[in-house]
């Protein structure tokens, strides 16, 4: 359990930038939590570098990360989930850089899944539904979701809708007729826990109906 590297320690290493970022995932594997860290500079030579977390742990002082290619990873039940932990980059017993981080403020939810879109002919709308594993979790239950959709031909013209439920209605008249749309969704913690957006769900593709010339309404698919 060593502290910050002193000036003059590891002279060669001092030239490098060891800044890193981490995210936590709670109850990601049953009751196990995970913590993932990576260097911000992809060119850092990680050969002899290790990560260690100390403090805010249950009945242990410190835990060592496993190295998985360019990322460092812990899966454990031993997070207290309150207060700050000291996360350090180490070479042997020497700490090169350390950060104090509250793991409840760097939570990255799991990506939503089972995204689908159903057209309701009578209502002239599309019902978007998706699922999230967080509905079953003890901790990170309350999420804000970001549904993004675009016409497939519009490379970067995404429309975003934020919602707290897992169901969204898109009005047909707000969409272009006879067009192919791509839609996807991601999540972020929204109560007590703080952190980052999840990865995006796999995209779902749907086509809007043609306009029915006599009524001015779209034809169903």
């Amino acid at each position: 359990e060593s502290g910050y590297a002193q000036n003059g320690d590891l002279e060669d290493a001092e030239l490098d930038d060891y800044s890193f970022s981490c995210y936590s995932q709670l109850e990601v594997n049953g009751s196990q939590h995970s913590l993932t860290c990576a260097f911000e500079d992809p060119d850092v030579n990680i050969t002899n570098l290790e990560f260690e977390i100390c403090g805010a742990l249950v009945e242990v002082k410190c835990l060592n990360f496993r190295k998985l290619q360019e990322i460092y990873f812990i899966e454990t039940k031993k997070f207290l989930l309150i207060g700050k932990s000291n996360i350090c980059v180490k070479v042997g017993e020497k700490s090169l850089t350390c950060k104090k981080i509250d793991l409840t403020t760097i939570v990255k939810p799991e990506a939503p899944f089972d995204l689908s879109v159903v057209y309701r002919e009578g209502a002239n709308d599309f019902v978007v539904t998706f699922n999230t594993s967080h509905l079953q979790k003890k901790y990170v239950k309350v999420l804000m979701h970001d549904v993004a959709y675009r016409q497939e031909k519009d490379e970067n013209k995404w429309t975003h809708v934020n919602l707290s439920s897992t169901k969204l209605t898109l009005l047909q008249r707000k969409l272009q007729p006879a067009a192919m749309y791509e839609i996807k969704v991601r999540s972020i913690p929204d109560h007590y826990f703080k952190g980052f957006w999840s990865e995006w769900s796999p995209s779902y593709y749907f086509r809007t109906p043609e306009i029915n010339n006599s009524s001015g309404e779209m034809d169903p698919i």
Partner: antibody, heavy 119, light 105 residues
Framework: QVQLVQSGAEVKKPGASVKVSCKAS????????MNWVRQAPGQGLEWMGL????????SYNQKFKGRVTLTRDTSISTAYMELSRLRSDDTAVYYC????????????WGQGTTVTVSS | EIVLTQSPATLSLSPGERATLSCSAS?????MHWYQQKPGQAPRPLIY???KLASGIPARFSGSGSGTDFTLTISSLEPEDFAVYYC????????FGGGTKVEIK
Amino acid sequence: QVQLVQSGAEVKKPGASVKVSCKASGYTFTGYTMNWVRQAPGQGLEWMGLINPYNGVTSYNQKFKGRVTLTRDTSISTAYMELSRLRSDDTAVYYCARGDGNYWYHDVWGQGTTVTVSS
Amino acid sequence: EIVLTQSPATLSLSPGERATLSCSASSSVTYMHWYQQKPGQAPRPLIYEISKLASGIPARFSGSGSGTDFTLTISSLEPEDFAVYYCQEWNYPYTFGGGTKVEIK
């Protein structure tokens, strides 16, 4: 102001159990750990364990594991320490102490509860 | 488990004198805290994270050190400073030292 108020003195027989309460006020109870520290007569301080009031997760000193149980009732901002199979050397003052999770020191202490174990 | 050894066990000094209290760890510690305890009272925090003054603590108290050796210094003893002082490591199992009693000479 931030305050921890503990239950009154107890006299117990060897082999019995004791449950000490610690009522918190003046802060968000679930935002800080609650630690328990004891002090035998004329002796130093000994950390027994802590509880995270938000989720009930506990961390115990191995010396007391199996004999001490920490619980909490968030609805009344109260933490509890129960020590079982009491022995005469458990005679001590028992303190609850709020844990500052940024720096992991005990920033606010209760007034202490004297537990006497005697046959 | 880390053992914290405080020395001296007793320090006999007069008001106005400088007090230097030592806390030695059996292996390296990242942060150390210090508490003051008077007879019949609960401990109160003095210094946290080696050198940061706890709320309401006068500037005559200071902390220093790293690795295995830490020091609490009281630059000029006031009558209310005569008490027992404990060091404590920041991490599980939050071990306390045995204490140093600062008494009036």
